[in-house]
């Protein structure tokens, strides 16, 4: 039973990751209520004394918000009535990582669920042919990563080949002194082959593919968040 003898309600969260300096979403849904004024949403964080965010009686209640989240949080007010308690977190900081609790009180009861939020930096790699090099060379660049990722090259033709001896990877600290630019160069590239530059840390995995033929160059890239059901 919840407060005032009310039953517990189902609250569901999804583990997610935030990209430093960008906006993030902490996902939370609950059994909806028919009256917005009866819904209270509270977000709390381990290690933080005040609330991350509070929404009650149809509006934000900021008096108990912890100073580290001031001006950076919002719920989707028009979606609360249908059971969306997700939190928008602006300008994600490295220190935003941790355990959060989405706590809901409605006329039906109360419930809560924890959410693990990871923070870091991740970006799409772009693979290009380096025409300045003396031999056929590919250059894979990704502007923002943190923590420092691993970079692995692969090829469609030479599956299972280890390219560590013919590649060189460097990490250059960006101006904000947290994230880094990733540059990896692959030498001795053969034509009519598809090469993949795979960048991975504990938050995300990104792949940049390039297919080089005599007549054209085709590129493709994608990014996947790890340990996240999003």
């Amino acid at each position: 039973f919840g407060i005032s003898g009310r039953h517990s309600i189902t609250v569901t969260t999804v583990a997610s990751a935030g990209n430093i300096g960008e906006d993030g979403i902490l996902s939370c849904t609950f059994e909806p209520d028919i009256k917005l004024s009866d819904i209270v949403i509270q977000w709390l964080k381990e290690g933080v004394l005040g609330l991350v965010h509070e929404f009650k009686e149809g509006k934000d209640e900021l008096s108990e918000q912890d100073e580290m989240f001031r001006g950076r949080t919002a719920v989707f007010a028009d979606q609360v009535i249908v059971g969306n308690a997700s939190l928008r977190l602006k300008n994600v900081q490295l220190t935003d990582a941790g355990t959060y609790k989405c706590y809901i009180i409605t006329s039906k009861g109360k419930g809560n669920a924890n959410l693990e939020y990871k923070t870091g930096a991740f970006s799409m790699p772009e693979v290009n042919v380096d025409y300045n090099a003396s031999s056929e060379t590919l250059r894979c660049e990704a502007p923002r990563w943190f923590p420092q990722p691993t970079v692995v090259w692969a090829s469609q033709v030479d599956q299972g080949a280890n390219f560590s001896e013919v590649s060189n990877t460097s990490f250059e600290l960006n101006s904000e002194n947290v994230t880094m630019k990733v540059v990896s160069v692959l030498y001795n590239v053969t034509i009519n082959n598809t090469y993949s530059c795979m960048i991975e840390n504990d938050i995300a995995k990104a792949t940049g593919d390039i297919k080089v033929t005599e007549s054209e160059i085709k590129r493709r890239s994608h990014l996947q968040l790890l340990n996240s059901k999003a």
Epitope: L44, L62, S63, E67, I105
Partner: antibody
């Protein structure tokens, strides 16, 4: 309605410890921090620290660091403030309060007297 | 840490007259993110815990008589009792809740002249 009921007055010897309790009712205890504030006789209000009951996260004023421990028991909706190595200057009324910023609800206060 | 300073320390005012208490913070308590001043005023009577009167510098707590008003922004704030009543005899405190550690002013004792 929100209520914070504190334990009774205490008389303690210098060097000893005191543990004051604060039982909360009328709201969801795990949702809001509990703050502790003290007031020496004829003096102003002084923030000691606070706790987030759901995670057990506590923050203390620099002055009390190492001498104070604030805890919370979710099962009984009770917060505790323990102050050790007591000295005569610790004689004060100790208040618990709901919230960590704006304090709308206070306990009735617990007088702690430190005397040899 | 933010330090709060009140003036005067005590104040004697005739019944029905205006009482004005000032509060100064050592740094601004105005948040640029929401344009709110994180300042509250409390009233404390002997043997009782403090009672919240005003928050966000100028918003009256429900049930507080409208003779109590708060004003100011940034670092300088004022609590005004427009027409002092006998039951207003108390000590008044300002408090910043902009950041921890929470800080209170030293208090202003209001008496009847």
């Amino acid at each position: 309605q929100v209520q914070l009921v504190q334990s009774g007055a205490e008389v303690k010897k210098p060097g000893s410890s005191v543990k004051v309790s604060c039982k909360a009712s009328g709201y969801s205890f795990i949702s809001y921090a509990i703050t502790w504030v003290r007031q020496a006789p004829g003096q102003g209000l002084e923030w000691i620290g606070g706790i987030n009951p759901i995670f057990g996260t506590a923050k203390y004023a620099q002055k009390f660091q190492g001498r104070v421990t604030i805890t919370a028991d979710e099962s009984t909706s009770t917060a505790y403030m323990e102050l050790s190595s007591l000295r005569s200057e610790d004689t004060a009324v100790y208040y618990c309060a709901k919230g960590q910023a704006l304090i709308q609800h206070w306990g009735q206060g617990t007088l702690v007297t430190v005397s040899s | 840490d933010i330090v709060m300073t009140q003036s005067p320390d005590s104040l004697a005012v005739s019944l029905g007259e205006r009482a004005t208490i000032n509060c100064k913070s050592s740094q601004s308590v105005l948040s640029s993110s929401n344009n709110k001043n994180y300042l509250a005023w409390y009233q404390q009577k002997p043997g009782q815990p403090p009672k919240l009167l005003i928050y966000w510098a100028s918003t009256r707590e429900s049930g507080v008589p409208d003779r109590f008003s708060g004003s100011g922004s940034g670092t300088d704030f004022t609590l005004t009792i427009s027409s002092l009543q006998a039951e207003d005899v108390a000590v008044y405190y300002c408090q910043q809740y902009y950041s921890t550690p929470l800080a209170f002013g030293q208090g202003t004792k209001v008496e009847i002249k």
